[in-house]
């Protein structure tokens, strides 16, 4: 079943309330390396994209590292996920209010198309963690995210035993898995070219549609 | 460089106890469990038990329940196996493991041969 | 019961494929994990989890699974891989590990 967006009737082409997010999107030049795809269209600045690229950013202060060094191949999906979070102004359908310090609003089950959330898994199951939700449960007293303490650093397949459970669990299922593939129109990618455009917007627009006609039926 | 280097070979009477110890340098050492495995002499290699260095929580195998006890030290980044009630059928390598998931051993100590001799 | 079987030595030609399997109950709700031990040494994981290789295992060993049963392949066999080869799995009841009995490999 597909739940609407919240109180929102402008599903297509905004920002997300959060900590970094732009108010209204638009062409951004200067995005910085992978988060440049939404150079033309965007709900981040070049200064969030350049940060987000660092370890340890002073985004959200997180470390990617917290058991030992994530390999670059492993990294370089949590990167292209932060640009797709700060950065998408295609996300709209999928928005929900949240009460949290840091943001008013989150995505909630976001559906990735299957091959970005197999990929994302098969090149990250033998880097280490010690969670499978990276949302909670973290200690932050030195201001980074550590491990709890006795949360034992294990392999990520150890922790996320399949795709879905990696791309659903790990934000508290901001993502769930499609059934859809790439370039199909029915799922979210993480990775696009944009020499081709966009294609997260006619994903948006199918999603937002859909919706609109799930309240109407609901209205009668 | 992930390094666990083990204590010296041990001579030990029947009825005696020896404690075998695993200092690891180059990684967390609260952040892994470390297991214990020992092979006899031409024999098969068997799992002693783990301990979880970040809390101290321990499991030890059905066959050494009772006489085996796995203990750290944080502050030395070290893990310690003694073994009581000594008996001939113990002489063996004693070998300490990092687990990085659930039983996958990838970083070995060198070993520590133990004697058990009248 | 928790036991791991694995067949006590196994031969193969240089340059062949030779399949080492093992056994047990416990495989058929975990992985089994593959260590290769030469004599006076310690033991050196060799695959684990799903057929995963840590750096500097060389390709031709992968792993694979069905059932109760694991198996380690090593495709073109060298000289530097005779070596006695344990499975080891997770036994969920209790998070205790139980090893295999080892199997011996000879290349010919």
């Known amino acids: 079943t597909m739940c609407s967006a919240q109180d929102r009737t402008d599903l297509l082409n905004v920002c997300m309330d959060a900590k970094h997010h732009k108010t209204k999107p638009g062409p951004e030049d200067k995005l910085h390396d992978q988060c440049s795809p939404w150079k033309k269209n965007a709900c981040c600045t070049a200064s969030t994209s350049q940060e987000l690229h660092k370890d340890t950013s002073r985004l959200y202060n997180f470390n990617w590292d917290h058991c030992g060094k994530m390999e670059p191949a492993c990294k370089r999906h949590f990167i292209q996920d932060t640009c797709l979070y700060e950065c998408s102004p295609n996300l709209g359908p999928w928005i929900q209010q949240v009460n949290q310090s840091w943001r008013k609003e989150r995505f909630l089950d976001v559906p990735l198309c299957k091959e970005d959330c197999q990929r994302w898994w098969e090149d990250c199951h033998t880097s280490h963690t010690c969670k499978s939700n990276w949302h909670r449960g973290w200690d932050w007293t030195s201001g980074v995210n550590k491990c709890p303490a006795g949360a034992l650093c294990r392999t990520f397949e150890s922790y996320f035993p399949t795709p879905a459970a990696l791309c659903e669990g790990l934000w508290s299922h901001s993502y769930k898995v499609s059934n859809y593939s790439r370039g199909s129109g029915r799922c979210i990618q993480m990775w696009f070219d944009s020499a081709q455009g966009n294609p997260n917007e006619e994903v948006a627009r199918f999603y937002a549609a859909a919706m609109h006609v799930n309240a109407g039926e609901m209205l009668h | 460089e992930v390094q666990l280097v083990q204590s010296g070979a041990e001579v030990k009477k029947p009825g005696a106890s020896v404690k075998v110890s695993c200092k690891a340098s180059?990684?967390?050492?609260?952040?892994?469990?470390m297991h214990w495995v020992r092979q006899a002499p031409g024999q098969r290699l068997e799992w002693m038990g783990w301990i979880n260095a970040g809390n101290g929580n321990t499991k030890y195998s059905q066959k050494f329940q009772g006489r085996v006890t796995i203990t750290r030290d944080t502050s030395a980044s070290t893990a310690y196996m003694e073994l009581s009630s000594l008996r001939s059928e113990d002489t063996a390598v004693y070998y300490c493991?990092?687990?990085?998931?659930?039983?996958?051993?990838?970083?070995w100590g060198q070993g520590t041969l133990v004697t058990v001799s009248s | 019961s928790s036991e791991l079987t694995q067949d006590p030595a196994v031969s193969v030609a240089l340059g062949q494929t030779v399949r080492i399997t093992c056994q047990g109950d416990?495989?058929?709700?975990?992985?089994a994990n593959w260590y290769q031990q030469k004599p006076g040494q310690a033991p050196v994981l060799v695959i684990y989890g799903q057929n995963n290789r840590p750096s500097g295992i060389p390709d031709r060993f992968s792993g694979s699974s069905s059932g109760n049963t694991a198996s380690l392949t090593i495709t073109g066999a060298q000289a530097a891989d005779e070596a006695d080869y344990y499975c080891?799995?997770?036994?969920?009841?209790?998070?205790?590990?139980?090893f295999g009995g080892g199997t011996k490999l000879t290349v010919l």
């Open positions: 080891d799995s997770r036994v969920s009841t209790g998070n205790h590990v139980v």
């Open positions: 416990s495989l058929r709700s975990n992985y």
């Open positions: 180059g990684y967390t050492f609260t952040s892994y469990a």
């Open positions: 493991a990092r687990d990085i998931s659930y039983g996958s051993f990838d970083y």
